[in-house]
Amino acid sequence: FGISGRHSITVTTVASAGNIGEDGILSCTFEPDIKLSDIVIQWLKEGVLGLVHEFKEGKDELSEQDEMFRGRTAVFADQVIVGNASLRLKNVQLTDAGTYKCYIITSKGKGNANLEYKTGAFSMPEVNVDYNASSETLRCEAPRWFPQPTVVWASQVDQGANFSEVSNTSFELNSENVTMKVVSVLYNVTINNTYSCMIENDIAKATGDIKVTESEIKRRSHLQLLNSKA
């Protein structure tokens, strides 16, 4: 790397969030090089003394990998040549949260960028009519959340109404003792209305909608990660 000390290359990362127990991606791109053997990728984590991952001379070099990442990391080897240094992190743990550095060396020079990685649990809510209840009741359930979220109900007809007096939310710890199941019940619902159950923590926001008419029930849900800056 004759000139690598004198030039800097552009490295770009994207803040992201990982869902505990699932696989996550730490995104990083750089100015590509024509020769794979000239590219070195190092992923480091603040406060962790071993490497998260290293890729050099066209293959993984994991002798100095920290044990907390053992067997859980991979780069997209076939995409390195086009400037993709993103890291796949398997089985995301709560302790994976923190500041990561994507450090790149190529024949053009070197560069790095930091990335904030949040970890938690988030899942899509499902809203159903609770036919077992004595009055018209909706039940909103989401299987995995962490940290503990807030739950807010809203309705299309009564916009701005506060449903806290007519709803009840409970959090039940899941078997792995970290994530929790969220159950929220809304009482005294009226027909021909669309209700939304909004679950939010500092990592994600999810909404489950249900439209109840005399002839049909329509459901829709979506989830959005917060603070992910492109």
Partner: antibody, heavy 116, light 106 residues
Framework: QVQLVQSGAEVKKPGASVKVSCKAS????????MYWVRQAPGQGLEWMGR????????VYAQKLQGRVTMTRDTSTSTVYMELSSLRSEDTAVYYC?????????WGQGTLVTVSS | DIQMTQSPSSLSASVGDRVTITCRAS??????VNWYQQKPGKAPKLLIY??SRLHTVPSRFSGSGSGTDFTLTISSLQPEDFATYYC?????????FGGGTKVEIK
Amino acid sequence: QVQLVQSGAEVKKPGASVKVSCKASGYTFTAQYMYWVRQAPGQGLEWMGRINPTSGNTVYAQKLQGRVTMTRDTSTSTVYMELSSLRSEDTAVYYCARGINWFDPWGQGTLVTVSS
Amino acid sequence: DIQMTQSPSSLSASVGDRVTITCRASQNIDTYVNWYQQKPGKAPKLLIYAASRLHTVPSRFSGSGSGTDFTLTISSLQPEDFATYYCQQSYTSPFTFGGGTKVEIK
């Protein structure tokens, strides 16, 4: 050059505590973990645990949990290993060693004798 | 914990002999194995790390293996090589050691 210098030999009574120090020089103290390994007379090597000098976070061998405490002083580049409720089977040479996935170098060792 | 079973526990050999020491891990540890040499009254010294990479030692020492089976070979034993050798896994904590192999003069 990288050096780890340990405190001198100790003789302790059963039930007492011992605190062994390990002073690092010749490298950035916070760049690598510090491990502790012990060796009973005529026996093999036993991994005791490690400390992250940056954060102070520790990992201990299960059999020593509750009796061992590893600390560090970044201002003097020194790590400490304290073992409490000593018993005769704790008689050993105690080593500190620097590393991530392999240990190099090692301290010269500290002989701790537990005897009534 | 991962067990490291080292064999033989001792061996007698002459200067110039080829010596092989083996280590077996109780589970797959990739190439996270290190070998140390210890002489009486001294601290252990790193010989080989990451299964096959020589530290600052003569080329007569070599290491091989991956997964569960690992070997330390001394191609031509020298007088200064009479010592006890330990393997160690660094795949996951606790970083356990093998029981040691004492290489004695025949």
